[in-house]
């Protein structure tokens, strides 16, 4: 999916209002220095591309992020503010249903969410730079 035509301001508002709080809740008990951020993003479409991939693509070490509250809100936000996004996400919905079975928060999932927080923060910064 090409995120170029999204309403970035609306996505930022949704992130600041709800998604960020859910991410921070998920990370509760860990310090921001506990994990080393190894990925970043260049501009707003790039940030959303990587956020979408990291949130919904299961990885061998962390297969269950898609069922989390922040992931559901991310999906809803992208569907709302990115034209045509929801039509591209049928496979992602199947992945979420499969992932719903396990509820263990592993250290690797915490690390992945730490990376997500970094990508979201970069998204906000690139937005500020453009204004």
């Amino acid at each position: 999916y090409d995120f170029t035509n999204c309403d970035f301001q609306k996505i930022e508002a949704d992130y600041l209002r709800t998604i960020s709080k859910d991410l921070i809740t998920y990370m509760s008990g860990t310090k921001s220095t506990d994990f080393n951020n190894t990925v970043s993003c260049s501009n707003r479409p790039h940030c959303l591309t990587e956020i979408q991939s990291l949130t919904f693509n299961p990885t061998p070490r962390c297969a269950s992020l898609a069922k989390e509250m922040f992931a559901r809100k991310t999906k809803a936000t992208l569907a709302l503010w990115c034209p045509g996004y929801s039509e591209t996400q049928i496979n992602a919905t199947q992945a979420m249903k499969k992932a719903r079975k396990s509820k263990v928060t592993t250290n690797k999932c915490l690390e992945q969410v730490s990376q997500l927080l970094g990508l979201w923060r970069r998204f906000i910064r690139t937005l500020l730079k453009k204004q």
Partner: antibody, heavy 117, light 108 residues
Framework: QVQLQESGPGLVKPSETLSLTCAVS?????????WSWIRQPPGKGLEWIGY???????SYNPSLKSRVTISRDTSKNQFSLKLSSVTAADTAVYYC??????????WGQGTLVTVSS | EIVMTQSPATLSLSPGERATLSCRAS??????LAWYQQKPGQAPRLLIY???SRATGIPARFSGSGSGTDFTLTISSLEPEDFAVYYC??????????FGQGTKVEIK
Amino acid sequence: QVQLQESGPGLVKPSETLSLTCAVSGYSISSGYGWSWIRQPPGKGLEWIGYISYYGSISYNPSLKSRVTISRDTSKNQFSLKLSSVTAADTAVYYCARTNLLYFDSWGQGTLVTVSS
Amino acid sequence: EIVMTQSPATLSLSPGERATLSCRASQSVSNNLAWYQQKPGQAPRLLIYDASSRATGIPARFSGSGSGTDFTLTISSLEPEDFAVYYCQQYSDWPQYTFGQGTKVEIK
């Protein structure tokens, strides 16, 4: 200390597919970062080809997108480049590199690929 | 596509002298700029990222500055091992990351 090592044929015929592999040691490619390919024609500058991230997202240079495939094999801790329909203009030293999806902090030593019949 | 233009193409200096290399972007890249050093027969090495942050293990004599379209790499006092080709790279315009054509720093 992460180390990257490119391997593959040094000579490819025009119209065929160039295939290279980058073996990574000292770091798991499924643990973090992105894993990228960059090339440098003899005596010329650098050109970014694309990357695959540790979680599987893939991004390509638009000028090469129609001909490029980057994939990975996490069990072997390596990633690969395929470039189809090559011409003499694809003759270059091909580098693999570790990236944070923005810039490139560790590089392989490079491998020269010549396209010639 | 953002075009990166480096100047001069060649810089002839003696060890101990100060080197000032320029990189100009065809449109603003904010501070999304990196500098690399490449010696003959070797891979490039990351020197500077985010326009002014030194990469791990890079000596303090290397410094970067600039924002927007104009950037500078300064080597305060050239060491014999600093004679090489230097490239700038913008990473503001995903998915079209581009490099400059390089500046060769040679011994005078």
